[in-house]
Amino acid sequence: LVPHLGDREKRDSVCPQGKYIHPQNNSICCTKCHKGTYLYNDCPGPGQDTDCRECESGSFTASENHLRHCLSCSKCRKEMGQVEISSCTVDRDTVCGCRKNQYRHYWSENLFQCFNCSLCLNGTVHLSCQEKQNTVCTCHAGFFLRENECVSCSNCKKSLECTKLCLPQIENVKGTEDSGTT
């Protein structure tokens, strides 16, 4: 199957790499603008220069292009705990990340929140905390994993998934409940 090409891709494919077809004259191929710049005016004719201008502060282009405007720099989302790893330059967008001992959780493709890495109290670290994944904990006997924390089996109710891990404790809890004590 031939992939469906958009109008811009169709126009670009007529010209050699690094050039694009003039929007008003499809017999002219203009040189694309370098990253960090944008298209101010198309080249007037074959072999003539494209008029490219540098992106203004707060904007960027990360690859060669024939965009009429630079792209706005991203802002790190403080409300999601994000911090700026590197600031925006004319040829690179802002890079956002998390603080030390935190990981990123992506709620969607373009939205992440920073959370503290689990310390595995009452357990051991099975896998260390990574940039995009929390620590994986293994809990000690008498504890079960809930929301990535090791919780005492005394907090395990019969209806919960922890019953298999906490079977002896559940029997004890059941016994105290039956006898009417708390």
Epitope: E79, H105, Q113, F115, N148
Partner: nanobody
Framework: EVQLLESGGGLVQPGGSLRLSCAAS????????MVWVRQAPGKGLEWVSH????????YYADSVEGRFTISRDNSKNTLYLQMNSLRAEDTAVYYC????????????RGQGTLVTVSS
């Protein structure tokens, strides 16, 4: 005790509008970032929008950008979601929630309000 109560859902035709409200109590509303999430039939939770404590910072999922508007009235402890140009794919149960703090789950969210977009 944290309480979040959504209202304003209902049946609406494609292209129509609805305004959801979320009445909050049991915590200092004016200090908290608030979130709207939704769950379509047979799907997982989708982050729709959020708004910071002061109402100055907002976020919208690509699927609702330009159609939905999140706002809040801190004097009334109420969160809103104005939904315009509704589409069939917006059909879902909409929940308001407190921004998670401890991990990627919602400790506090409402019981939800159903929005059905159908002709």
């Amino acid at each position: 005790e944290v309480q979040l109560l959504e209202s304003g859902g209902g049946l609406v035709q494609p292209g129509g509008s609805l305004r959801l409200s979320c009445a909050a109590s049991g915590f200092t509303f004016e200090n908290k970032t608030m979130v709207w999430v939704r769950q379509a039939p047979g799907k997982g939770l989708e982050w729709v929008s959020h708004i910071d404590a002061t109402g100055t910072i907002t976020y919208y999922a690509d699927s609702v950008e330009g159609r939905f508007t999140i706002s809040r009235d801190n004097s009334k402890n109420t969160l809103y979601l104005q939904m315009n140009s509704l589409r069939a794919e917006d059909t879902a149960v909409y929940y308001c929630a407190l921004l998670p703090k401890r991990g990627p789950w919602f400790d506090y969210r409402g019981q939800g309000t159903l929005v059905t977009v159908s002709s």
